[in-house]
Amino acid sequence: VPRWRQQWSGPGTTKRFPETVLARCVKYTEIHPEMRHVDCQSVWDAFKGAFISKHPCNITEEDYQPLMKLGTQTVPCNKILLWSRIKDLAHQFTQVQRDMFTLEDTLLGYLADDLTWCGEFNTSKINYQSCPDWRKDCSNNPVSVFWKTVSRRFAEAACDVVHVMLNGSRSKIFDKNSTFGSVEVHNLQPEKVQTLEAWVIHGGREDSRDLCQDPTIKELESIISKRNIQFSCKNIYRPDKFLQCVKNPEDSSCTSEI
């Protein structure tokens, strides 16, 4: 067994990772009083326990179960917003529409958003040099397994009408290989979810095409329909105006199509 540090293809653990996770947990409990029963030290210990001393290509959902249990949170199941390749706008939306939630508005999503982490087999060290890349190295790495686990649970919790924001500027507006396409779509519960409503966000100022007719959207509709869930789709031609109208719905310019 080589004793030198394994070199992976992806960036290493985010600097100040333990401090950041702990600080984020405390911040979250400060601004979400209903989560003040959470013991942030235990949360960090469970997070650490999921990947420390384990081979970073051999992580399982089971490894994250203690963390999942500590981070259990009830969000209104009919107020869930999924997103794919358009995170910033989705977060701007829930920041204004306070009764809707993305995964990153929950404790576990908030803790891990934009962070990278991994350990090394048989040592208690965190690897700040490199971590496995999903494509080039392995899919069962700490970060990918974490997001797969929390995304599955989030989708499973959804009910009634579930919304998803999709990036209309991408070549594949719906991508089967994204977390939304590979995990969330398949874990929506048909006995609870009536409709998946896609919001296709346009990028270009002059783009007046109906992107709901895009072949990848038709593919999404087909997958969803086969799961006995209704599908609907809306074009959001002007994302800036869309956000403005969510903020000020009584504005006279907000009656026209956005």
Epitope: R16, E19, T20, L22, A23, R24, C25, V26, K27, T29, E30, I31, P33, R36, H37, D39, C40, Q41, W44, H91, Q95, D113
Partner: antibody
Framework: EVQLVQSGAEVKKPGATVKISCKVS????????MHWVQQAPGKGLEWMGW????????DYAEKFQGRVTITADTSTDTAYMELSSLRSEDTAVYYC????????????????WGQGTLVTVSS | DIVMTQTPLSLSVTPGQPASISCQSS???????????LNWYLQKPGQPPQLLIY???TRAAGVPDRFSGSGSGTDFTLKISRVEAEDVGVYYC?????????FGQGTKLEIK
């Protein structure tokens, strides 16, 4: 040592906008929520809102909603509070404030305060 | 919003004597985590408020032990066992159980 240092006093005309800064030192800016509190002369304390400097997310008291904007610049470790459409009732001292963390739990009390910024609204 | 009501609004105390300030909340401030989210502050003239007590009864760092907080879910008391000249100012209670955090109207303490 934790310090919150606010910008100087301002005199504004009704209808104008004021922007107050709060520069922090002695801790990692993004690790804590920053709150803003208003104190009108001879009156009590009124919470205005908070910002999470790391994400830029905010929440405001209903009373100030639509007129207040709290922002943060992580490159300079500075939080800002902007109040628009000023009226005479906005004449007050404005404070930035932060909680202490007691063994990985937010205390729920504002343990650190800026020195305050007096804003006078007068025609 | 939770309403905080303080009594009395002012009091005058002889140095070395005890003082007591009451605060009542319109809802219980006891969280399911067992903590009561009630804070006490002292604001001295020309200064920002300083935290004295958090979680109803825990003294903040550097606060003398003559200050103590007690109470139940909705009725709270700040006691100063022996008032000193430096204790003059306005005392505020505050709830931080939920947003928006709200303050009492303040109690002015002066020395006789």
């Amino acid at each position: 040592e934790v310090q919150l240092v606010q910008s100087g006093a301002e005199v504004k005309k009704p209808g104008a906008t004021v922007k107050i800064s709060c520069k922090v030192s002695g801790y990692t800016f993004t690790d804590y929520i920053m709150h803003w509190v208003q104190q009108a002369p001879g009156k009590g304390l009124e919470w205005m809102g908070w910002i999470d400097p790391e994400y830029g997310s905010t929440d405001y008291a209903e009373k100030f909603q639509g007129r207040v904007t709290i922002t943060a610049d992580t490159s300079t470790d500075t939080a800002y509070m902007e109040l628009s459409s000023l009226r005479s009732e906005d004449t007050a001292v404005y404070y930035c404030a932060r909680v202490a963390i007691i063994t990985t739990v937010a205390s729920g009390g504002f343990a650190y305060w800026g020195q305050g910024t007096l804003v006078t609204v007068s025609s | 919003d939770i309403v905080m009501t303080q009594t009395p609004l002012s009091l005058s105390v002889t140095p070395g004597q005890p003082a007591s300030i009451s605060c009542q909340s319109s809802e219980s401030l006891l969280h399911s985590n067992g903590k009561t989210y009630l804070n006490w502050y002292l604001q001295k003239p020309g200064q920002p408020p300083q935290l004295l007590i958090y979680w109803m009864s825990t003294r903040a760092a550097g606060v003398p032990d003559r200050f103590s907080g007690s109470g139940s879910g909705t009725d709270f008391t700040l006691k100063i066992s022996r008032v000193e000249a430096e204790d003059v100012g306005v005392y505020y209670c505050q709830q931080f159980l939920e947003y928006p955090p709200t303050f009492g109207q303040g109690t002015k303490l002066e020395i006789k």
